[in-house]
């Protein structure tokens, strides 16, 4: 499994002369995943014109990508650590099928796509250790995920490119919301 940035892998920030707290390690780990998403987005945008497309809404309707809302307790107004952590973990678990879809969608960044997927699994494990209310976390049904994956892979080329773009964009935003919320915990 990938190591956490700030330990043995290349760190996104300065090297540390003292051990990182659990929150700081998670922060660095999310930043590491965001770097990976950035690289994948570069390849996607270079390969097609999806990043400038105005037809995103057409494809977005077919996707049920996790998104932060005020009710999730992760915003400053009405912040609730337990509710928010449940939303973060549940959202990351829901993203896993979409990250699986991204595998084989990249030519020059194949390893990067795998690293994003594996690092997200590690992140989920770290956050599950932090969560008190694990019972409230719903794990997606494997059969539902399998049929969703089949459905996504059966799309035409244009829709597959658009789906790839939307997954990366939504996952980036979800992680950015996570970063901000986790800094309050």
């Amino acid at each position: 499994a990938p190591v956490l940035p700030g330990e043995d892998s290349k760190n996104v920030a300065a090297p540390h002369s003292q051990p990182l707290t659990s929150s700081e390690r998670i922060d660095k780990h999310i930043r590491y995943i965001l770097d990976g998403i950035s690289a994948l987005r570069k390849e996607t945008c270079n390969r097609s014109n999806m990043c400038e497309s105005s037809k995103e809404a057409l494809a977005e309707n077919n996707l049920n990508l996790p998104k932060m809302a005020e009710k999730d307790g992760c915003f400053q107004s009405g912040f609730n650590e337990d509710t928010c952590l449940v939303k973060i973990i549940t959202g990351l678990l829901e993203f896993e099928v979409y990250l699986e879809y991204l595998q084989n969608r990249f030519e020059s960044s194949e390893e990067q796509a795998r690293a994003v997927q594996m690092s997200t699994k590690v992140l989920i494990q770290f956050l599950q250790k932090k969560a008190k209310n694990l019972d409230a976390i719903t794990t997606p049904e494997p059969t539902t995920n399998a049929s969703l994956l089949t459905k996504l892979q059966a799309q035409n080329q244009w829709l597959q490119d658009m789906t790839t773009h939307l997954i990366l964009r939504s996952f980036k935003e979800f992680l950015q919301s996570n970063l901000r919320a986790l800094r309050q915990m």
């Epitope: 996104v12 920030a13 300065a14 540390h16 003292q18 990182l20 707290t21 700081e24 930043r31 965001l34 770097d35 950035s38 932060m68 915003f75 400053q76 107004s77 964009r169 980036k172 935003e173 950015q176 919301s177 970063l179 901000r180 800094r183 309050q184």
Partner: antibody, heavy 122, light 107 residues
Framework: QVTLKESGPALVKPTQTLTLTCTFS??????????VGWIRQPPGKALEWLAH???????RYNSALKSRLTISKDTSKNQVVLTMTNMDPVDTATYYC??????????????WGQGTLVTVSS | EIVLTQSPDFQSVTPKEKVTITCRAS??????LHWYQQKPDQSPKLLIK???QSISGVPSRFSGSGSGTDFTLTINSLEAEDAATYYC?????????FGQGTKVEIK
């Protein structure tokens, strides 16, 4: 290139409400990870962070001034507005708006406006 | 709230000299510390982020180091245009706070 510009009254009377507008270009508040913050600096003194607003409308205020501050955004106009109620002479300062965030939702200000001096006096 | 204390408050330095400004945090902030330069009658400008990361367009004579509670901004070979007040900022937790500033004057 990224630019920000503050506008508002140069003079306000005690107890009045101050409304400041930050108009920016070169980035968008519809881009995830982005935000705009307000910082002030009384003459000859240090900087003080007041409030900021993020791309998704999440807001944060300096707890010492929270009851007096309101921040809002108009993404289509590329503007962020700060209102501060019950102004007092001690609120005399240069008020700056600045861009915050980025890929890592950084808690830093990487571009600043020129600032606008607000004097509170009767 | 995290209190940042800079030292010295004021420094008068001759050109080409090395300048060292320190910033001490009241509790550990890892490397979430940023440095700004403010020239007279100008707005602040980001110099260094995350304690030691350089910013595009900032001369290489500016560097930063430190982690935890103790941080340093170094100006190697001071130039006349570096006359300014330098501030450190806590980017770790709320409220975001600044040091009181260090004014660097050219002799």
């Amino acid at each position: 290139q990224v630019t920000l510009k503050e506008s508002g009254p140069a003079l306000v009377k005690p107890t009045q409400t101050l409304t400041l507008t930050c108009t920016f270009s070169g980035f968008s508040l519809s881009t995830s990870g982005m935000g705009v913050g307000w910082i002030r600096q009384p003459p000859g003194k240090a900087l003080e962070w007041l409030a900021h607003i993020w791309w998704d409308d999440d807001k944060r205020y300096n707890s010492a001034l929270k009851s007096r501050l309101t921040i809002s955004k108009d993404t289509s106009k590329n503007q962020v507005v700060l209102t501060m109620t019950n102004m007092d002479p001690v609120d005399t300062a240069t008020y700056y708006c600045a861009r915050i965030g980025g890929l890592y939702v950084d808690y830093l200000m990487d571009y600043w406006g020129q600032g606008t001096l607000v004097t509170v006096s009767s | 709230e995290i209190v940042l204390t800079q030292s010295p408050d004021f420094q008068s330095v001759t050109p080409k000299e090395k300048v060292t400004i320190t910033c001490r945090a009241s509790q550990s902030i890892s490397d979430y510390l940023h440095w700004y330069q403010q020239k007279p009658d100008q707005s602040p400008k980001l110099l260094i982020k995350y304690a030691s990361q350089s910013i595009s367009g900032v001369p290489s004579r500016f560097s930063g180091s430190g982690s935890g509670t103790d941080f340093t901004l170094t100006i190697n070979s001071l130039e006349a245009e570096d006359a300014a007040t330098y501030y450190c900022q806590n980017g770790h937790s709320f409220p975001w706070t600044f040091g009181q500033g260090t004014k660097v004057e050219i002799k």
